[in-house]
């Protein structure tokens, strides 16, 4: 059998607005007073098991005590009324949970969406957190009929239980209620058809056109409530490797359609497409994007000829020479398709010409010492590029005109080359480069630049701390001009090793030091200067700096009959490196001198 409590706290379910004051009272039963020989002054109030300070407590009469809290902020507090029986023993009389929070704000931003094939979902902004159990009810009605209430689980949205009826306006609002108050949102009035979010278009397919390499035809299936709605589309596309989408102008896809031709595309390029739809009036919501579909535009003839150059091999006697014609494969953006082969035509005179069909990117031919004209065209499935034409002059002709003020410099991790054009109109420029090494031959790479270019960067994969020999040749209608060369580094480093110094001649008071240039493979940069450090075993070290053009230096004012230690360092723009230490001893007497 449950024991009757000794008293009660009022209110029994206290809910307080945060920041406000609150008073609770504890009323003891008469029987309790007599049984425990107590009165209200024996009451001890506690919050979460901690005694409430006396100044918050008031004894109203022998049975009743009150407690007052100002600026309540804790969300939940266990409030208990206790009596001190027999002077010391604390006995719980009654306990309540005091909650604090806020009345609901008026819900705002009420919006509804009809996801095709589903019931209507409405969402709203409930405003500030109430910290209390708050019920949100979505109400909806026609002018003449109420619909079932929708009780929100999360307080921010609710999906109604009934299927929407289109082309009839509905009124919708939200009611919010908790222990501290009740409030309604503004109502919204709309036709559910204007809130439809269609299912994404599907079966998107992409086909190309043999006639036009710049178009792709799209077709798809739209739902639109099973044909009940006319939908307009939004089409986006990108090249396969791009991350940003290109927008087809919305005005081009305003009318309801299930196909579209995208224009101004690049030939032989793979494009990815996606599409979404919305009611043609623009009301409602865009569908999610369709699954992506891709297609490749048809090939077109190559848009330009390959870069074209030649190298003459050592002569086979006097009658003819071997010439290696070389060209670069076109980038995809210019090949406009799969390059099947190249057509090379060599013409010696009007009557003598030879045509070659080549699948690679070079051709070695034997030519007499006459002037030749070589033409090169790339061919794909659709056709041939325009021809690149090179005049190969007689070897007896001396090339005139070369570029001037040739410079090379590293910038932004690229090796740049610039020059001043020659005074005669140029057809194009050829840049050739290779790594200078004493251990391996100079394997050349090359590139072609248009006649208008006088500054460019080398487009190969260059290595740091390697010496590049760069050659620039202007090409004229009559053939190549003179070549200008220079050396350059993409990035310098300190030398890999320092110079090895030796003595060439040692006298009583001077010594001629000599050294070899550091091999180019170990230089790692331009050697700007040398330093020579020399000292005796007891003296302080002396340092002299020597220009990089020297390979000898004379140390003077040396002491006779003395051991000297010498070391040399070589410096690039990026630092220095010491060579090995070398020792020599000056003689006690000069030549012919007697003790």
């Amino acid at each position: 059998q449950l024991l009757e409590p000794c008293g009660y706290i009022y209110p029994e379910f206290p809910v307080v607005q945060r920041g406000s004051n609150f008073t609770a009272i504890c009323v003891l039963k008469e029987a309790c007073l007599q049984h425990y020989y107590v009165n209200a002054s024996y009451i001890v109030w506690k919050t979460n098991h901690a005694a409430v300070p006396r100044e918050q407590v008031t004894v109203i009469n022998r049975t009743t005590s009150s407690v007052t809290f100002t600026d309540v902020v804790l969300p939940s507090v266990q409030l208990t009324c206790n009596i001190l029986s027999f002077g010391q023993i604390e006995q719980n009389v009654y306990g309540v949970t005091m909650l604090s929070g806020f009345p609901p704000d008026k819900p705002t931003n009420l919006t509804c969406i009809v996801n095709e094939g589903k019931n209507m979902l409405c969402q709203w902004d409930p405003g500030r957190e109430t910290y209390l159990e708050t019920n949100y009810t979505l109400k909806s009605e026609w002018a003449t009929e109420k619909f079932p209430d929708c009780q929100s689980k999360h307080g921010t949205s609710c999906m109604v239980s009934y299927m929407p009826t289109y082309y009839v306006n509905i009124e919708v609002w939200v009611e919010a209620e908790n222990a501290l108050g009740k409030v309604s949102s503004e109502s919204i009035n709309f036709d559910p058809v204007d809130k439809v979010k269609p299912t994404p278009p599907y079966n998107l397919s992409v086909t190309n056109s043999e006639e036009l390499s710049s178009i792709l035809k799209l077709s798809w299936v739209s739902s639109g409530l099973g044909g009940l709605l006319d939908l307009k589309s939004d089409i986006q596309y990108r090249t396969k490797d791009a991350s940003t989408w290109i927008q087809v102008p919305l005005e081009d896809t305003m009318s309801p359609r299930t196909s579209f031709t995208v224009q101004d595309l690049k030939p032989f390029t793979e494009y990815v497409f996606r599409i979404r739809s919305i009611k043609d009036s623009g009301k409602g919501y865009w569908s999610d994007w369709s699954e992506e579909a891709s297609g490749t535009t048809y090939e077109d003839r190559p848009s330009r000829p390959p870069s074209f150059w030649y190298k003459t091999n050592p002569s086979h006697g006097q009658e003819y020479r071997s010439v290696r014609l070389i060209w670069k494969a076109l980038p995809l953006s210019e090949a406009n398709g799969k390059i099947l082969d190249y057509e090379v035509i060599l013409t010696q005179s009007k009557s003598v010409s030879q045509t070659y069909t080549v699948t690679g990117t070079e051709l070695t031919v034997n030519l007499t010492n006459d002037r030749y004209v070589a033409s090169l065209a790339a061919r794909n499935k659709v056709g041939k590029s325009a021809a690149a034409v090179l005049t190969i002059p007689s070897p007896h002709v001396t090339a005139a005109y070369s570029v001037v003020n040739l410079k090379a410099f590293p910038k932004d991790n690229l090796l740049w080359v610039e020059w001043t054009p020659p005074p005669k109109p140029v057809s194009k420029y050829i840049l050739e480069w290779c790594v200078l090494s004493e251990n391996a031959p100079c394997v050349e790479d090359w590139q072609q630049e248009d006649a208008t270019v006088n500054r460019t960067h080398l487009r190969g994969r260059l290595l740091e701390s390697k010496c590049y020999q760069i050659t620039v040749t202007p090409v004229f209608a009559t053939g190549p001009g003179g070549s200008e060369s220079l050396k350059a580094y993409l990035k310098q480093a300190a030398p890999a090793r320092g110079p090895t110094v030796r003595t060439k001649k040692v006298g009583k008071n001077e010594a001629v030091l000599a050294w070899d240039q550091i091999p180019v493979d170990d230089q790692n940069g331009f050697i700007r200067n040398y330093s020579i450090s020399y000292r005796t075993s007891v003296g302080k070290e002396m340092v002299v700096h020597v220009d990089s053009s020297h390979t000898e230096y004379t140390l003077s004012s040396l002491s006779s009959d003395t051991l000297y230690m010498v070391r040399m360092a070589a410096y690039t723009d990026e630092g220095g490196k010491d060579g090995p230490e070398f020792t020599f001893t000056t003689p006690k007497f000069a030549q012919g001198e007697i003790e």
């Epitope: 010696q348 005179s349 003598v352 034997n366 030519l367 007499t368 006459d370």
Partner: nanobody, 125 residues
Amino acid sequence: QVQLQESGGGSVQAGGSLRLSCGISGFTYRPTFMGWFRQVLGKEREGVAAISTGGGSSVYADSVKGRFTVSQDSSKNTVYLEMNGLKLEDTGMYYCAASTVITSVSINRALYQYWGQGTQVTVSS
């Protein structure tokens, strides 16, 4: 591997005829012109006739003009030398040669890079 193989040589009476054939194989690109040369023991090899593989134009040594005819069958990769009115001085080893030099057809020996093994022609009285 480039190969030139002559055939059709032999012995013939003065005033008689012979037809030499040269089969060519192994070329990536066809030669620009083909030639026939002959060599008599102890003498320089001399040009007899040559034909352009493209246009079919031909040249002859003065000593054989009007008697010898050079021709080709592109489909069979074969070059022929038709020799009529053979003389005693036509005796010698006949070689087929191929040139890849892009120039007018010529019997200049220095312009030829590829040679056959030769076939013997003997003219007797």
